[in-house]
Interface confidence: low
């Protein structure tokens, strides 16, 4: 349905509060280095303009596209060239090239200081003094650090952020009330950002067919009672929503997401029995709830898949008539029967099935050729099952920190060219799979673990794309989305790698170690561990364990000393010398 003024249409649909929030997020995700005040000024100008268009859709410039309006506004920033360098060249382009240019300059690892949490009283005062500015600042700070954050979901986070302050700033013990809520929001926010980044990578690097396949598998697991046609409709709508958000079309994305939530709630009977409690909630909460809804129960009497997909003589005819629909139906049928499989495994099975049909439908006896296709699935299923089993055993044996260290060593040996901060970040997150998934019942472990690992490995791929240093990483990241995790799992010690020269400064520690939080201490130690492996890639587990145990003892000793700095100065070189000897 066409509108004379797109900006007026979206303003009326979304309402002023959501409109302003989404425009602020959009601008902050594009111009990540701009000061807060500059963005607020731009947002206010766009909002005032939108109001004039609501009053009169025929007013000057109201017929322009949102990309044109927003792009023109971004290009008025005076310091664009100094702050963003070549991104300023985008402004010389016409739409749609200009928006594509802005998108290409989004920085997944912006050089921004980590967010420091002020004292609770300071935050509560700021919240009470100017609630609107306080919440805008939250949107701005998160959006500029996470340029692909799912914008309508970020509005939901902001609403929870506001609720936390409104409740806790009145509490007797403000800190006890507020800090756990902020920790939860931070952790959930990081997870949400990473999940969305994978969706955008899937769409941008592998196309909407890849995203649709992912969505068919996931929605079929969630809604096993829904018909294939119903799942297909949801997949089409969901693909549109995420394509828009990943493309920077945040107003359209939020509007379409609201429409999708409305549709799902109006058609619960044909989708899932689990939607009811979501549908009673207000919009932002409702959309979030629907996205996170648990899997519905599987219908009791689902027939064997073999009849339609192996035993039938019409397999090749059905495949030839409409390949994508036939494969989509296969994926739907397989996924709704297997909530215990990861989405990535289901996609590998569909890919294997497609490859078998491509080969067999051209053979002399197609039926004979594809008769054993399900047997070929067995090794594909067993590989992630075994991986989860082994890694959960290791996690239970070692605990999270040492499990992370085992992964740090494993991944540094695989891809030692990758920067140390990236290896530490990625391995620490890979290690969190243990606490997240290993405590779950058997039937939920694989979907939890492998789909989480896909999200974490996508972060590695995204960071590596910015500064490529390893052909092996490039290969695993670009060849196949569904095989990324098996590709990384299969990597061995890089024999071609020339060990990094020993640099004593890397292993120089100071008294400030003692005042760090437990997490910061772990990161310091893990950074040293990566550097050790880069220096001695063939070091054994035992050797590395010995060095790390000595390191922990050395830090503990010096942190107990009266003159900590002197202790680090005197014991540090001894630790370095002993470590070099132990690894010689």
């Amino acid at each position: 349905d066409t509108h004379k003024s797109e900006v007026a249409h979206r303003f009326k649909d979304l309402g002023e509060e959501h409109f302003k929030g989404l425009v602020l997020v959009a601008f902050s995700q594009y111009l990540q280095q701009c000061p807060f005040e500059e963005h607020v000024k731009l947002v206010n100008e766009v909002t005032e303009f939108a109001k004039t268009c609501v009053a009169d859709e025929s007013a000057e410039n109201c017929d322009k596209s949102l990309h044109t309006l927003f792009g023109d506004k971004l290009c008025t920033v005076a310091t664009l060239r100094e702050t963003y360098g070549e991104m300023a060249d985008c402004c010389a382009k016409q739409e749609p090239e200009r928006n594509e240019c802005f998108l290409q300059h989004k920085d997944d690892n912006p050089n921004l200081p980590p967010l420091v949490r002020p004292e609770v009283d300071v935050m509560c005062t700021a919240f009470h003094d100017n609630e609107a500015t306080f919440l805008k600042k939250y949107l701005y700070e998160v959006a500029r650090r996470h340029p692909y954050f799912y914008a309508p979901e970020l509005l939901f986070f902001a609403a929870r952020y506001k609720a936390a302050f409104a409740e806790c700033c009145q509490a007797a013990d403000k800190a006890a009330c507020l800090l756990p809520k902020l920790d939860e929001l931070r952790d959930e926010g990081k997870a949400s950002s990473a999940k969305q980044r994978l969706k955008c990578a899937s769409l941008q690097k592998f196309g909407d067919r890849a995203f649709k396949a992912w969505a068919v598998a996931r929605l079929s697991q969630k809604f096993p009672k829904a018909e294939f046609a119903e799942v297909s409709k949801l997949v089409t709508d969901l693909t549109k929503v995420h394509t828009e958000c990943c493309h920077g079309d945040l107003l359209e994305c939020a509007d379409d997401r609201a429409d999708l939530a409305k549709y799902m709630c109006e058609n619960q009977d044909s989708i899932s029995s689990k939607l009811k409690e979501c549908c009673d909630k207000p919009l932002l909460e409702k959309s979030h709830c629907l996205a996170e809804v648990e899997n519905d129960e599987m219908p009791a009497d689902l027939p064997s898949l073999a009849a339609d997909y192996v035993e039938s003589k019409d397999v090749c005819k059905n495949y030839a008539e409409a390949k994508d629909v036939f494969l989509g139906m296969f994926l739907y049928e397989y996924a709704r029967r297997h909530p215990d499989y990861s989405v990535m495994l289901l996609l590998r099975l569909a890919k294997a099935y497609e490859a078998t049909l491509e080969k067999c439908c051209a053979a002399a006896d197609p039926h004979e050729c594809y008769a054993k296709v399900f047997d070929e699935f067995q090794p594909l299923v067993e590989e992630p099952q075994n991986l989860v089993k082994q890694n959960c055993e290791l996690f239970e044996q070692l605990g999270e920190y040492k499990f992370q260290n085992a992964l740090l060593v494993r991944y540094t040996k695989k891809v030692p060219q990758v920067s140390t901060p990236t290896l530490v970040e990625v391995s620490r997150n890979l290690g969190k799979v243990g606490a997240k998934c290993c405590k779950l019942p058997e039937a939920k472990r694989m979907p939890c673990a492998e789909d989480y690992l896909s999200v974490v490995l996508n972060r590695l791929c995204v960071l590596h794309e910015k500064t490529p240093v390893s052909e092996k990483v490039t290969k695993c990241c670009t060849e196949s989305l569904v095989n990324r995790r098996p590709c990384f799992s299969a990597l061995e010690l890089d024999e071609a790698y020339v060990p990094k020269a020993f640099n004593a400064e890397t292993f120089t520690f100071h008294a400030d170690m003692c005042t760090l939080s437990e997490k910061e201490k772990q990161v310091k130690k893990q950074t040293a561990l990566v550097e050790l492996v880069k220096h001695k890639p063939k070091a054994t587990k035992e050797q590395l364990k010995g060095v790390m145990d000595n390191f922990a003892a050395f830090v503990e000793k010096c942190c107990k000393a009266d003159d900590k700095e002197a202790c680090f100065a005197e014991e540090g070189p001894k630790f370095v010398a002993a470590s070099q000897a132990a690894l010689a």
């Epitope: 004593a504 400064e505 120089t508 680090f568 100065a569 005197e570 540090g572 070189p573």
Partner: nanobody, 116 residues
């Protein structure tokens, strides 16, 4: 060959000042952290202060904090130690080292005596 030549020591009254220098050669000076160490007769060497390769991170033993200042000139391949408010207990032989090691290597050291 790596060489470190210390200079600037001498006799000074309590409360006085001295500036020690360490001229380095034979290695990429700007790539290495450097330290000053002192040794009392018959005692183990004691770390005094360190500075990183770029010169933007300095560290001090508690006993000299606020009185001594370490710096470097990478263009001149030279390390310095500005010593103010000197006390009798600062009397020792001072020498520079590469990195954070307190073990003396390839350096003669320079004697500092604080006495009235």
């Amino acid at each position: 060959a790596v060489q470190l030549v210390d200079s600037g020591g001498g006799l000074v009254q309590p409360g006085g000042s001295l500036r020690l220098s360490c001229a380095a050669s034979g290695f990429s000076f700007g790539s290495f952290g450097m330290s000053w160490v002192r040794q009392y007769p018959g005692k183990e060497p004691e770390w005094v202060s360190s500075i990183n390769g770029r010169g933007d991170d300095t560290r001090y033993a508690d006993s000299v904090k606020g009185r001594f200042s370490i710096s470097r000139d990478n263009a001149k391949n030279t390390l310095y130690l500005q010593m103010n408010s000197l006390k009798p207990e600062d009397t020792a032989e001072y020498y520079c080292t590469i990195g954070r090691s307190v073990s003396r290597s390839r350096t003669q050291g320079t004697q500092v005596t604080v006495s009235s």
